[in-house]
Every structure is written in structure tokens, then in C-alpha cells.
Amino acid sequence: EPTMYGEILSPNYPQAYPSEVEKSWDIEVPEGYGIHLYFTHLDIELSENCAYDSVQIISGDTEEGRLCGQRSSNNPHSPIVEEFQVPYNKLQVIFKSDFSNEERFTGFAAYYVATDINECTDFVDVPCSHFCNNFIGGYFCSCPPEYFLHDDMKNCGVNCSGDVFTALIGEIASPNYPKPYPENSRCEYQIRLEKGFQVVVTLRREDFDVEAADSAGNCLDSLVFVAGDRQFGPYCGHGFPGPLNIETKSNALDIIFQTDLTGQKKGWKLRYHGDPMPCPKEDTPNSVWEPAKAKYVFRDVVQITCLDGFEVVEGRVGATSFYSTCQSNGKWSNSKLKCQPVDCGIPESIENGKVEDPESTLFGSVIRYTCEEPYYYMENGGGGEYHCAGNGSWVNEVLGPELPKCVPVCGVPREPFEEKQRIIGGSDADIKNFPWQVFFDNPWAGGALINEYWVLTAAHVVEGNREPTMYVGSTSVQTSRLAKSKMLTPEHVFIHPGWKLLEVPEGRTNFDNDIALVRLKDPVKMGPTVSPICLPGTSSDYNLMDGDLGLISGWGRTEKRDRAVRLKAARLPVAPLRKCKEVKVEKPTADAEAYVFTPNMICAGGEKGMDSCKGDSGGAFAVQDPNDKTKFYAAGLVSWGPQCGTYGLYTRVKNYVDWIMKTMQENSTPRED
């Protein structure tokens, strides 16, 4: 417990102190006091540096003194032989004696008292920044006018914080500017502008003079600007060392001026103003900004339009432009939107053709459609090459966005027919020689495929059965073979209007206009065993001359059989109509003169007994195209004949091309178009 005074006596005092003693006393007086320790008697064995016996006075870690020997007072009015004054409130006294004393020594008597210390003067470090006031047991600090005492009760500073500047323009200076700024102060100024405006600070070099940095480059006094998470400074020295124009990119700025105790200069003065927040002129690829400006600021609106072939994709919706607004935070709205290359998507598939999977479906990519060759070709031209256009469509130079159309190649058999000897006098054939050949099972007859949806045949074949069952793609017509071939289902039968319908068809003598069309329900898929025959052109090139050769095919009667099982074919020449007239009808159902011969009929045959016969009706009389030797066209259709193995009569298809085309056009479906 601290005391204000006390007495310290050596052991056995005033008797001689014993040998080999070590004793210490801890003196403590109240806080705010020092200690005055004084000795009134001192009789201790003398030795060099008081090595044998001694009394030691310690203050903290410092030895204030070490005493031995005898002392007497120099002042007859004072008993004090030795004294110590320490400005601290604690002191330690230690007495030591060695193992022997040559004489009898009585030791010491000492007294301590608490004494007032002058904190204002007694220490090297001045406790107060400005005015120090001592009192018994303590001190207090005070400040000059316009200064206030900080919470540490030692330092005085200027009350320069708390100002908030909201005007769009203003001036701020250090306290007392241009007189020296106060020491030991922290001045904080706040600029708070409306959102969308950035604080721009401007200084002149000469308006800045702040205590320079130390040798390590640290500012002793400093000016700092803080805008959000950005800091400008600290700045110090003679003349402003930073940029004279500071764009803070923020509507809020804190200015912090910190000074220490020494080295006051004139300080600083700055101006500020609010600039509408600039937004960067961003480089948005593949787009154009409207309006184009050197600088964009808060509330500016731009329309960003994608270049051709690029689009903005937001969700599932594609657009060619978007608006962006310069926002209060200096960032553009819709900044996530980008002009991306237009994606034309996976190209549409086409019937009877294909498109290779594109490496890319983006703007500028190229794809190629091809038809399933050699059975289909591209009807509407354009070469099949499409590029991904700016509007997101696959576009062809000729067709635009219209898709190519693959239509069957006509009149080209996969294997040419080599003339043998059967049919009537014709020979075995393969369906690949006559891929247009259609088989009708009731009545047993033939027809010719002329495109995906239409079969051409003789009127007398379908007059009694308007829902014929037809097959394509098979050389042989056994049930098992037909089951593996393609069955065609009719949608409607169109008999030529000039064909006379009879109640008893068996007695027919007039086969004029013996032609009919069968519209199919579904399109036929072409291939090596199924493909159409061409129609004749309307030019005179397609007028047949006597001797012109044509091919006939079918499963009709042969020399050995009423019906062939495997396809038969023969090559026959065109003959004058009179040759057919001259042949006697084998089993006449009427007078020979009753049989009608017209220009709508072709007469052919007469060579080596080659002829069509019962069961071949409706099949094509195929002639090589005069303008393209690789193709065959249907010059005639097997119609009737006076006698098998002689001459036969065939419907002259050229005379019906207009009717065929008109019938097909009027009865086409959107799917075909």
C-alpha cells in the first residue's frame, strides 16, 4: 500500500549490523508523486566500489546510488548526510554485508517522503502538446484558443472535421490557410454529390505546401483523398506532387489532412466540381454506337447496333440492337449484352437430299446441300451452296432462303438393257434395266413411273379398277418377290377425257386416247430399281420416225407362258400405221374394219416376232432422248394389237403431254410443291 513517508533502518540499528545480511525495502508512494530519500546516519564498512558492504538505491532498472563508509552532515542545521530525489513513485533500497567486518559498523538510518513532481518540467518528454499545468500529485494539459484537447487529455488539435460539401462546385483549404496549419490535427472533409456525378479535384502546385516526407519517404504531415475503394495520396512536400486534376470516378470523396506536432507550413487550397459521371467508350466488338461521341457521361443513352451478321441474344430472343444508358456508377447498363455472330442454326433437311453437318452454323459459315445422286438432282438450281446470312437464314445466291429441291432423275436405268431374245421374241430383263416399270396385279398389266407421285398407264388398264394395287422395284412378280418390293397405293385415277367408256370393254374396237394417270398417296423413294422415265418434249425432235427403236418391257404373255414371272423386254422399231392395219386381228370381237386407227397411236414391231402382248398393257415404249442419249422417254404406252408377235399399237404420249402436265399441276399437293 503506497505511503507518503517512512523510515528505513539497517538491521540491529543502532547496534552493529550482522555479517552476511542482504535485506531490501520496496518503497512506494502514491501516483503523481516522486520520492525524496535521505540518510541521517551512514556507518558501513568502506571498500572500493562498496564491494564488501553497501546500501544500494534502485529506481526501476537504474541504480540511483550505492553507499558505504561514514558520512557526516555538511550543514550544521541539517542531519542529512546523503539524499536522493527521484520523479518516480517507486524505489528499492538493498542492504548487503559480507562475511566479516574488521570493525563494528552501526549501519544506516534513512527516511523517505512523497514529494510533488513537476511533470511539465521534470521530464525530457513534454507531456502536453501545448500548455502544461502542474499541481501537487499531478498535472493537466490545456490548449490555446480555437484548439481543443483530444481524448488522450494531452494533445490539442483544431476542430476542423465534420464539414460536408454537397454543392456541385466548391473550394476547400487547410485551417488558417495561407497561414501555417495547426499541428497535431486530423482534418476530415466530406464531399457528397448527387449520384451520377463524379468529384473532380483541381489543385495548383503553388497552392500546396505541407511538411516534407522523412528520409524513408513517409509523409509527416499528409493530404489523402479517398473515393470508395480508391485512394489518392498521401501527398506532402513543397508544391503539389500529384495530378493537378483528379477524376475520382465517385460522387463521394473524403479528404483527410493529418499533421504532427512539428513543422507547420502554409498548407493547401483546392477546388472541386461535380462532373457528370463518365462512362468509358467501350470497345464492343461487331457493333456501332449511335450517337458517336468522344466522351459519354451520366444519363447519356446510346443505341448499340450490331454489324450485319451479328445479333444480341437475350434469353431466346435475338435482336440487332439494344440501348445502353450511362449510369450513376459510371458503368453502362446492359453491359452484359454483346453482339454475337448470328447463328443460323442446324440447316433444315431436305427430301431426297442431305446437308453435311456444318463445322459452324455462325454468320459466314457455308453449307452444301446435295441430292441423293444418281437418283435425284437439284431442280431449282443454285448449286446447293448456302451461307449463313446476317438475318440468321441460310441463303443461296440464286434461291435466297428457299431450300433446294431434289427431284428424281428420269430415264436413266442403272444397268443398260442388252437385247436378248424373249417377251414375244424378247428376252429376260432386270428391273434395273427398266426402273420405271410398274406392275399392276389386277388386271395383270404394266405402267410407267413418271415422278414421285404419278404413274402413267393405259386407260384400259384402270377403267375397270380405279384402286389398282401397283408394285415397283422387283424383277420378278411372285408373291414373295412382290412382298419384298415397294407397293404403291393409289390416291386417284385420272382417265383421259377422250377415252370412251364401254359397258362391255371386251368388245372394244376403239383404243383412241388410251392413257391414264394414277396419283399416288405417298411419294416413291427412288433408287437403283425404282426411278422414273422422262416425258417427251413438245418440240419436233420428239416426233418419231419409222425405224426409230424403242424398248418395251413387262410381265405379259410370252411364247411359253400366259404371264411372265420375271420381267421381259424387247427392242422394236417404229413402223408405219398401215403395217398394223394390215395384220389380221387374231380373235376379232368385231368386224376388222371396226378397229379404229388414229394419229394418237404408234405402230411398232414386226421384227423377229418381237412384240408386246396381253399383260404388258400400260408399260412404256421407251425411246432414247434425242437431246440426251443417256436418257429414255416414254414415247408410247402399250395399248392394243391385232396379233401378238406381229405389230403392236402404242398410245402416242407426245400428244398428251399438255394433258399430263395440267392434270399433275392441278392435283399436286403442297408437299410436292
Partner: antibody, heavy 118, light 107 residues
Framework: EVQLVESGGGLVKPGGSLRLSCAAS????????MSWIRQAPGKGLEWVSY????????YYADSVKGRFTISRDNAKNSLYLQMNSLRAEDTAVYYC???????????WGQGTLVTVSS | DIQMTQSPSSLSASVGDRVTITCQAS??????LNWYQQKPGKAPKLLIY???NLETGVPSRFSGSGSGTDFTFTISSLQPEDIATYYC?????????FGGGTKVEIK
């Protein structure tokens, strides 16, 4: 006169191969469909394979499918049967036959014997 | 595959007898059937095509009939040179199948 002459038969070990030939004369070979038909010793007739005039269409009996190959060379008037992976049950007299028309065989060769035995 | 069952497998008859062989198909084969004659050590010979048509040069004592699944081959008056094995063959579908054969002998 129509003539068909087979050759190439003989003794072969199981798993071995053999190529039979049939030389045609007296008719236009390329006009006709052709077939191979075999007859195991003391047994009935078994159709083996068929080929169209141009050679583009071929059919095989299930028992030889994948092992035998029929072919023809119209320029040489010849029909062939390549027999691989032969088995004991392939032992037979092999006839080549002309399909007169519609699957009726009007002319046959004299046959060639193939023996598959280890 | 279509199965062809021929019966009898063998028969013995006297010269001048009427001989009948039957052939039954496992499914409808229309009239797609041929008949062949094979003499010992010889190649087969076509006699009848399309179930009932006599091949050129074949004696008229041979005949065929039937349609669908049941077919008959007849020798109206057996002759010594008719000793042979007779086969039916369907061509309605692949594989083309022969009957098991009927061996005809003279008593």
C-alpha cells in the same frame, strides 16, 4: 448345241477352299440367269446359288451364305463358285444350270464332284 | 423357307401303268412349280414348268397339275425309259427348294 461343263472339283480338307468353274457354249451366255445346284451322294437336289445376267443380283441358300460366292464373266462365257470354309456336309456333285426363263432349268452340266474330308 | 414334301419316296409300277407323284408345299406357291427327271448318273432334265406346261420335246405322256399347295405329276403310261428319280421344285421364293425326290422303278 447348248453345253455346260463344270470343273474345279476334287478332294479338300475341312476349312479349305475350292473354286468351281462352268464353261458355257452353244448359246449367248449373257442372255441367261445361271445357278449352281448340288447333290450329295445318294441324296436329292439342293439349290445353292443364283446370279442375274449382269451379275448384279445374287441369291444364296442359307447353308452356304457367307462362305460361297457366285460370279460370272460374260466375256469368257464362264460361271464361277468360290467355296471357302468348306465342311464335310458340302461334299456333293455340283451342277451349273441355265435358267431357261422364269426359274426353270432347261440345261444342266454333267457335274463336278467336291469331296470335303480330312 | 418353303418346304416341299414329295410322295411317295419310291414306287414300283409296270410298263403301261399310270403313275402319280404328289408334291405338297408348306405355303401357297401359286403355280410356281417345275418337275424334273434325273436318270442314274445323269444331270436332271426339265419336264414341266409352271405346274402344268410341258417343256418342248418332252413326251405328252408326262403331265402336271395343281395350284397353291398341292401338285400332281402324272405319267399316263409308264415306259421302260421312264425309270428315274423325279423332283418337284418351287420358285415362289428364295431359296429355291426341291422336293425329296420319288424313285420310279419297273416291276
Amino acid at each position: 448345241e447348248v453345253q455346260l461343263v463344270e470343273s474345279g472339283g476334287g478332294l479338300v480338307k475341312p476349312g479349305g477352299s475350292l473354286r468351281l468353274s462352268c464353261a458355257a457354249s452353244g448359246f449367248t451366255f449373257s442372255d441367261y440367269y445361271m445357278s449352281w445346284i448340288r447333290q450329295a451322294p445318294g441324296k436329292g437336289l439342293e439349290w445353292v446359288s443364283y446370279i442375274s445376267r449382269s451379275g448384279s443380283t445374287k441369291y444364296y441358300a442359307d447353308s452356304v451364305k457367307g462362305r460361297f460366292t457366285i460370279s460370272r464373266d460374260n466375256a469368257k462365257n464362264s460361271l464361277y463358285l468360290q467355296m471357302n470354309s468348306l465342311r464335310a456336309e458340302d461334299t456333293a456333285v455340283y451342277y451349273c444350270a441355265r435358267d431357261e426363263t422364269d426359274y426353270a432349268y432347261d440345261n444342266w452340266g454333267q457335274g463336278t464332284l467336291v469331296t470335303v474330308s480330312s | 423357307d418353303i418346304q416341299m414334301t414329295q410322295s411317295p419316296s419310291s414306287l414300283s409300277a409296270s410298263v403301261g401303268d399310270r403313275v402319280t407323284i404328289t408334291c405338297q408345299a408348306s405355303q401357297d406357291i401359286s403355280n410356281y412349280l417345275n418337275w424334273y427327271q434325273q436318270k442314274p448318273g445323269k444331270a436332271p432334265k426339265l419336264l414341266i414348268y409352271d405346274a402344268s406346261n410341258l417343256e418342248t420335246g418332252v413326251p405328252s405322256r408326262f403331265s402336271g397339275s395343281g395350284s397353291g399347295t398341292d401338285f400332281t405329276f402324272t405319267i399316263s403310261s409308264l415306259q421302260p425309259e421312264d425309270i428315274a428319280t423325279y423332283y418337284c421344285q418351287q420358285y415362289e421364293d428364295y431359296p429355291l427348294v426341291f422336293g425329296g425326290g420319288t424313285k420310279v422303278e419297273i416291276k
